[in-house]
Each structure stands twice: as structure tokens, then as C-alpha cells.
């Protein structure tokens, strides 16, 4: 049934995150009369599309329409009808589209018209599909996560209203891990950015910020796995592939066209005797690192330090806030308690990616095989990518929390992105005090 | 905006090799592809291959495969494509163009001689 | 490898009428409907300038009186209403699949 207007001066805005796996809805409420107050924002539903990401419909374009159906048709029941015409809509294509449009601009051109063509068809006011740079990525994700925390927020507050929050106004780094890309952003500390593509200056609440932020294409979690398989079965001698970042008694054929259909592969193709071939697990955690150490070059770095393929990296300071994947992927192996050291989470990746996938099937029996088979390698990536990609240690671990949700808003980039694109974080602190969260919630 | 800037012309002996480097600059230089074509005096356009400044990765036109090498240095977003054994018929203008499968950026090309 | 056929191999046409160039492709450069076709305008001394991309698409900046038509293997490139400044000589390419080919290109003069 159709919602009645509500009485208050509320107003609504939708993002898609057409990422590479999946595309996500979200819908965001607000009071009219504060859009300027920090903290207002918050999330009132997320849908998840059903299906791949966008970058997948390429052989399929006239099925984009039904495909975004379902979660469009639930924002026409969630936002009130009065409200639908001036609601703003906004899909931000990331790392999936960003590869298709490395392979082909006609290709990608052609998915976002569809992609445009179908949104246009609501009721809302549709401002465009585009694909975002990794550095937007980067950079929306550090204002969600810091919008949603309070950080900009010029009233000190002796209690915490959110979980994480050190009473203090130090911004958190944001670390985002997606399917095909993955982002690190934060404020260094009187470093100087010594690569000016990796440096963002913003002011916000009256105040400026030094922000370091870089996107590593090809790093996501799935396009990292094929970057693992290509490289490892270049070694291979015959069509079997031992894997030690699957379960011992796994098995999957693996096409060679399939591996080699991505950008990200490029650099270890080779012309194999073989069509096909399979992936025999043997879940070896300690091996499974090794290879996945492999895909990170070290060796090479032109400035006074890297995080790995020459990137620049300022040391690391302050707290960060893991999200997307790295929150997915750690939840699901139970390890974003704050109390769990790294030392203990690799132990216990030790012990998860030695159990035999029969057992691993029994005890996960709703989870589909496709993501379950997979959560050994996804973790133990994000071990090897936190600690010798970013160099995080032992020690620092402690300074990164795994957030799914803060104040009942997702972090990731498309809260972010709506605030900047609706004007709703001046660069000047408000004339009128902004009231604390706990107003609104 | 998008820039590609090549370097300047060479004149080089048969038998030799040459490096012709490619700036880029307005955009971000791993999200695309750079292509390498060349044109020789009267000739049709003849694209050479192109490289994946990403990781590296490389595709070569048949005919240019084990002469012709393209890499990148990405701290520097700059492309570079060197031709070796060098024979007569190489003399040509040599570009650098943007793209996937869309080449609408191209450097201004860089005339190379190839003389006794 | 698929060969680009253009023609004619030279044009001479008045001011204010009409330009007429054709592509043929020895195999369809069509794949997941869409043509991987492109036009592109050459004046000495200068790199080609994109014109059309995806058969009939213009480029950016690319004035109106341009316009690129066909699918699979027949292509056309029109100048509805050519300008001193078109003198030029244009060229077509396929990027359907490697080795990217172009046409031997046509000469455009003012008759």
C-alpha cells in the first residue's frame, strides 16, 4: 500500500552502487529545515538487486530494465508519492564498469544508456548513471564514514553517541574492499602527499583537510583471485591446479577463457595447451599467503615509501574504518570482534582454510558453495593486503575496526557521494548550532 | 584535460632501435589502455599493439611481435614503445593514441627516420 | 585479419554539398550490437581526429554537418555540407578484434 505524506518536512534521495558483483540500492532520509546540520543523513533501506554487477549485462543489455525492477519499484513504496518527484537518483558505477570500459568505451557507453533509459522510466528525478573514479571512491567513502561518526561536527560531546567514537575530532581512515578495486584513504599526519594524484584537499565545517586516498584496480577481492589463478597456472604442469587457498577435497574447472576475459589477467597471459582446468584444493593457509605476497610488487618504489606496484603511501596514522568487503568477509569468519588480535585472526585462518570443504559445506549449509568456497582465500587476502600491502602490523591492528553499519547508515561511498552532490556539506560551519545524532535517532 | 605528449623526432641507422615516450596527463593513466600506431609517407594507418598500464600486459599486431615492446612507468603516466632491428620501410610518424576500442586521444606524433 | 575497403580514394566536391565516403569491412564488425566502427579526419601534419565512433556516434566537437551510418560490414561517412576546413583526407577503422585495422583513406578536396 501506498505511504501517506508524512506531516514532517522530510526529504529523500536514492544511490545504486553498481559495483562489480552486485548492484545496491540505498535510500536516504533527511529534515528539510537542517540539510546543512551534520549527522542528519541517515540510510531507511538498502536493496540489494538480484543479479551480477552491470558490467555483466553486456551480452544481455535489454534485461538491465527488469533487472532493476524489483529495488526500484520497493523506493516507490518506501518514499512517500509526494515526494517521488523531486526525490533525486543517482547510480555511481564503480571498478566492474571502470574495466569495461578499459576493454571497450562502446561497451560500457552502451550498458549505461540501457542503465539510464530504464531509471528514467520512474517517477523520481533520475540525475544520471556514470562511472566514478577510483579516487571519488576513495574520497566518499572517508566522508561517509566520517559524516556518519561525527567527526565533522564542531560541538565536543562528553558522551559517544556512535560505537568506535574517541571523543575527539581526528577523522578516521577508510578502507574499502569491493570485488575489483579497493580503496585506502586518510588524513596523514604533517606528511606531505609526494604524489599529486593521490592528494585530495577538502574543507568541511569551516575546517581543511590533507587527504591522502588511492583506488588499486584489479585488488578487489574476485579480480585478485584472478589474478592469483592466472599467475599460478602459468607454473602449472598440466591442468590441474593445486590451490592451497581452497579447502582440501574442492574441486572447480576453471575455463581459460573465462580467466583471461579481464584486464586484470593481462599481465600473465600465456598461451596454455589446455581449454580448461581444475582447481584442486588443499588448504594450505601459510601457501596460500605466499602466492597471494606474489601478486604485490615490493620491489619497485619511487618515492620515500610505498604500499606495493610503486604506490605512494604516507605511514599510517589514526584509526580506520574497514568496510564493504572487508566487513563481509571478516563477519562471516567471525573475526571483527575489536578484542580479536591479528595474531589470532591468523590463526584461526589457519585452522578455517585447513578444513576439508565437505566438512566446511556441512557446517555453512546456507551459504551458497560459489561465496563459501571462496571465504578462505577472501580472508586470507585481506590479512596479506592490510599487512603487507598497507603495513599494517601486529600492533596497528588494533586501530582498524570492521564496520558494517554505523548509526544504522552502510559505510561505503554512496552516502558520501550523495551529500556532495546535493550540496549538503558546506565547506563553512553552519550559523546555527547542529544538534547532536541523538536528536534524530 | 586529456593530454598525450610525445617525444621529439630521431633519426636512427638500420639495424638499430628506438624509444619513443608518450606523457599523459588529465586523466587517470591506469583506467585506459595505450595504443601505438604508425604511419609511413603516402601509407594507411597501422596500429602496432598496445599495453595495459594497469600491470603491463601487452598485445601486438603479428607483424611487429618480437620487434616491438611497449611499457609504461606509471609514476610517471608515461608510455613508451621502442622498435628494434630497424629497417628502411620503418620510417614513419609514430603515435600514441587513448582508448580501449575508442581512439579519441592521440599524442602528436613522432617522426622517425630510419637512414644509412 | 579483416581489411578495411574504402572509396572512393579521392573526392572532389563544391562548397555547401554533400560528401559521401564508404567502409567496407572483409568480415561483420558488429559484436553485442554494437558496430566497432570509427571515422577519423587527418589534415597534414596533424595526428587523426576522432569523428564517429561506434558507426554513428560524433565524436566530441565534432560540428553536426558529420554523421556516420551502417552495421556489420557497410559503413558511410557524410558531410552534409562541406567546409573549406574539411579538406582533409578520412579514414575508417575497425577495433572488433586485434590486429585494429584502418582503411587506405580518402582524399577530400574542394572541386
Known amino acids: 500500500t501506498q505511504n501517506k505524506a508524512l506531516p514532517e518536512n522530510v526529504k529523500y534521495g536514492i544511490v545504486l552502487d553498481a559495483g562489480s558483483s552486485h548492484t545496491s540500492l540505498y535510500i536516504y532520509k533527511w529534515p528539510a529545515e537542517k540539510e546543512n546540520d551534520t549527522g542528519v543523513v541517515h540510510q531507511v533501506e538498502e536493496c540489494r538487486v538480484k543479479g551480477p554487477g552491470i558490467s555483466k549485462f553486456v551480452q544481455k543489455v535489454n534485461e538491465i530494465g527488469i533487472y532493476l525492477t524489483d529495488c526500484m519499484e520497493r523506493a516507490r513504496e518506501v518514499i512517500p508519492r509526494s515526494q517521488h518527484q523531486e526525490t533525486p537518483v543517482y547510480l555511481g558505477a564503480t571498478a566492474g564498469m571502470r574495466l569495461l570500459r578499459m576493454e571497450s568505451e562502446e561497451l560500457a557507453d552502451r550498458v549505461l544508456d540501457v542503465v539510464e533509459r530504464s531509471l528514467s522510466n520512474y517517477p523520481f528525478d533520475f540525475q544520471g548513471a556514470r562511472i566514478i573514479t577510483g579516487q571519488e571512491e576513495g574520497a566518499y567513502g572517508w566522508i561517509t564514514i566520517n559524516y556518519l561518526l561525527g567527526k565533522f561536527s564542531q560541538k565536543t560531546r562528553w558522551f559517544s553517541i556512535v560505537p568506535y567514537e574517541t571523543n575527539n575530532q581526528e577523522t578516521f581512515g577508510a578502507l574499502d574492499l569491493g570485488g575489483a578495486s579497493t580503496q585506502v584513504t586518510f588524513v596523514p599526519q604533517n606528511q606531505t602527499i609526494e604524489s599529486p594524484d593521490n592528494a585530495l584537499q577538502f574543507r568541511l565545517y569551516g575546517k581543511d583537510y590533507n587527504v591522502y586516498t588511492h583506488s588499486f584496480l584489479c585488488y578487489g577481492k574476485d579480480q585478485a583471485l584472478w589474478q592469483k589463478l592466472a599467475k599460478d597456472i602459468q607454473v602449472a604442469s598440466n591442468e590441474i591446479l593445486r590451490d592451497p587457498c581452497f579447502h582440501p577435497g574442492y574441486k572447480k574447472v576453471v575455463n581459460v577463457s573465462d580467466l583471461y576475459k579481464t584486464p586484470c589477467t593481462k599481465r600473465f597471459e600465456m598461451t596454455l595447451p589446455f581449454q580448461q582446468f581444475e582447481i584442486q584444493g588443499i588448504g594450505n593457509y601459510q601457501q596460500c599467503h605466499q602466492s597471494i605476497l606474489e601478486l604485490f610488487n615490493t620491489s619497485y618504489c619511487p618515492y620515500s615509501q610505498c604500499a606495493f606496484n610503486g604506490i605512494f603511501l604516507p605511514p599510517l596514522q589514526g584509526d580506520f574504518g574497514a568496510f564493504s568487503a572487508f566487513y563481509f568477509v571478516m563477519k562471516f569468519l567471525n573475526l571483527t570482534s575489536e578484542k580479536v588480535s591479528q595474531e589470532k585472526v591468523t590463526e584461526m585462518m589457519k585452522k578455517f582454510c585447513a578444513q576439508p570443504w565437505e566438512e566446511i559445506k556441512t557446517s555453512y549449509a546456507g551459504v551458497k558453495e560459489k561465496y563459501l568456497s571462496e571465504y578462505c582465500f577472501s580472508g586470507t587476502y585481506i590479512l596479506s593486503l592490510l599487512l603487507q600491502g598497507y603495513h599494517f602490523t601486529a600492533d596497528s591492528w588494533e586501530h582498524i575496526h570492521f564496520i558494517g553499519k554505523i548509526q544504522g547508515s552502510d559505510a561505503g561511498w554512496t552516502l558520501g557521494y550523495m551529500l556532495n552532490l546535493t550540496n549538503m556539506i558546506p565547506a563553512e560551519q553552519p550559523l546555527s548550532t547542529p544538534l547532536s545524532h541523538s536528536t534524530y535517532v | 584535460q586529456v593530454q598525450l605528449v610525445q617525444s621529439g623526432a630521431e633519426v636512427k641507422k638500420p639495424g638499430a632501435s628506438v624509444k619513443v615516450s608518450c606523457k599523459a596527463s588529465?586523466?587517470?593513466?591506469?583506467?585506459?589502455?595505450m595504443h601505438w600506431v604508425r604511419q609511413a609517407p603516402g601509407q594507411r594507418l597501422e596500429w602496432i599493439g598496445y599495453?595495459?598500464?594497469?600491470?603491463?600486459?601487452?598485445t601486438f599486431n603479428q607483424k611487429f611481435k618480437g620487434r616491438a615492446t611497449i611499457t609504461v612507468d606509471t609514476s610517471a603516466s608515461t608510455a613508451y614503445m621502442e622498435l628494434s632491428s630497424l629497417r628502411s620501410e620503418d620510417t614513419a610518424v609514430y603515435y600514441c593514441a587513448r582508448g580501449g576500442t575508442r581512439f579519441a586521444y592521440w599524442g602528436q606524433g613522432t617522426l622517425v627516420t630510419v637512414s644509412s | 585479419d579483416i581489411v578495411m575497403t574504402q572509396s572512393p580514394d579521392s573526392l572532389a566536391v563544391s562548397l555547401g554539398e554533400r560528401a559521401t565516403i564508404n567502409c567496407r569491412a572483409s568480415e561483420s564488425v558488429d559484436n553485442f550490437g554494437v558496430s566497432f566502427m570509427y571515422w577519423f579526419q587527418q589534415k597534414p601534419g596533424q595526428p587523426p581526429k576522432l569523428l564517429i565512433y561506434g558507426a554513428s556516434n560524433q565524436g566530441s566537437g565534432v560540428p553536426d554537418r558529420f554523421s556516420g551510418s551502417g552495421s556489420g560490414t557497410d559503413f558511410t561517412l557524410t558531410i552534409s555540407s562541406l567546409q573549406a576546413e574539411d579538406v582533409a583526407v578520412y579514414y575508417c577503422?575497425?577495433?572488433?578484434?586485434?590486429?585494429?585495422?584502418f582503411g587506405g583513406g580518402t582524399k577530400v578536396e574542394i572541386k
Open positions: 588529465g586523466y587517470t593513466f591506469t583506467d585506459y589502455n
Open positions: 577503422q575497425q577495433t572488433k578484434e586485434v590486429p585494429y585495422t
Open positions: 599495453i595495459v598500464p594497469l600491470n603491463g600486459g601487452s
